[in-house]
Amino acid sequence: HTAAQDNCTCPTNKMTVCSPDGPGGRCQCRALGSGMAVDCSTLTSKCLLLKARMSAPKNARTLVRPSEHALVDNDGLYDPDCDPEGRFKARQCNQTSVCWCVNSVGVRRTDKGDLSLRCDELVRTHHILIDLRHRPTAGAFNHSDLDAELRRLFRERYRLHPKFVAAVHYEQPTIQIELRQNTSQKAAGDVDIGDAAYYFERDIKGESLFQGRGGLDLRVRGEPLQVERTLIYYLDEIPPKFSMKRLT
């Protein structure tokens, strides 16, 4: 697994322990919490990152209206169960035997139940809407410049194939980034949109997962983009199953 050979670190995941004990003395990095080997040439899965985090001390309107089935991650942090590939297991349970089903980005998509709860498959999140509100600037951003800068960011920093950035919408001061990736579209080696969105979220919150700097400060044609708030909506290939009680 590619890691910085000289000082044996993982450029794409600071929440790792690395040592030159791979084949031929190569640098190998393992995720904190799970101890799973990670590929440092790409993004680490969100499931392994959450596990590591828990183990660490401490006009016509161009904006998209999230669908009624869109999920927001209101449950926050938990210590997830990951499969051997580092993906979320469909069923997650806590220490008190409360269980629930999650989607491929680890967001709860059913009511909570007990150990008898069945989650037949891991439902894929195929559409992610990242909703940002920026602080006042010297003037509105040029839409095409903003579009180009955000596409460049997802391509270069998060290694996400450009075809998965479906659209960038802008209606000052709201920016929306749409990521779309169906099961059939995702080839081996492609970064998952859920992982890219998670890295982006952590960057915006000043908690970069990359080695080095603490956060991400965006500029569009030199203009500082200071984010005021971020909301992320997740849409699954199969709508979530919540009781009417929760919906009211």
């Epitope: 603490g214 203009e223 200071q226």
Partner: antibody, heavy 119, light 106 residues
Framework: QVQLVQSGAEVKKPGASVKVSCKAS????????IHWVRQAPGQRLEWMGY????????KYNEKFKGRVTITRDTSASTAYMELSSLRSEDTAVYYC????????????WGQGTLVTVSS | DIQMTQSPSSLSASVGDRVTITCKAS??????LAWYQQKPGKAPKLLIS???SLETGVPSRFSGSGSGKDYTLTISSLQPEDFATYYC????????FGQGTKVEIK
């Protein structure tokens, strides 16, 4: 190497205006905004505003709005800060600064221009 | 506006001492914090940005930590050239500075 060179010290009377220049070199002038920050004697640093040389857009600290005007001459790679209706409290060292290449912190600073307001 | 409160406003220390300066923001600034060193008659010099990232050429005795509203600058072993005034600055919502901490020779 990146350099910001400011104009010399000024002495002004209350009510007058002052215009300070900041010449940038060692990088593409239109790539970064230019901030203006001032420091009155014994006081903290105070952000006044910035100009984006790429499109002439400006953003000001509310405290100085109406009194400060930041402009630029792209052909001369120079930014200017003009402060009007001067009062004695405006006696300070005025700095121009350029952001860090990766963050919005201020990495490169001019040497400072002392503006004294006195009758 | 976000207010930045630095403490102490001044401190006396000897060469070799460990020095800690704290900075508290009036709201969460999500690690958008920089530390500057300023010597008399000179412009500020950027030491740390992103709360923890040391700038190129800055000695490793300087370190930054913290998150949310609370941040710290530590000088592990004070050197003669470190006697100066230190400022914190937030850049999460426009730009504001702390009032400064003057580090003097004991």
């Amino acid at each position: 190497q990146v350099q910001l060179v400011q104009s010399g010290a000024e002495v002004k009377k209350p009510g007058a205006s002052v215009k300070v220049s900041c010449k940038a070199s060692g990088y593409t002038f239109t790539t970064y905004v230019i901030h203006w920050v001032r420091q009155a004697p014994g006081q903290r640093l105070e952000w006044m505003g910035y100009i984006n040389p790429n499109n002439d857009g400006t953003k000001y600290n509310e405290k100085f709005k109406g009194r400060v005007t930041i402009t630029r001459d792209t052909s001369a790679s120079t930014a200017y800060m003009e402060l009007s209706s001067l009062r004695s409290e405006d006696t300070a060292v005025y700095y121009c600064a350029r952001p860090h290449f990766e963050t919005h912190a201020m990495d490169y600073w001019g040497q400072g221009t002392l503006v004294t307001v006195s009758s | 506006d976000i207010q930045m409160t630095q403490s102490p406003s001044s401190l006396s220390a000897s060469v070799g001492d460990r020095v800690t300066i704290t900075c508290k923001a009036s709201e969460d600034i999500f690690n958008r914090l920089a530390w500057y060193q300023q010597k008399p008659g000179k412009a500020p010099k950027l030491l740390i940005s992103g709360a923890t990232s040391l700038e190129t050429g800055v000695p490793s005795r300087f370190s930054g930590s913290g998150s949310g509203k609370d941040y710290t600058l530590t000088i592990s072993s004070l050197q003669p050239e470190d006697f100066a005034t230190y400022y914190c600055q937030q850049y999460w919502n426009t730009w504001t500075f702390g009032q400064g901490t003057k580090v003097e020779i004991k």
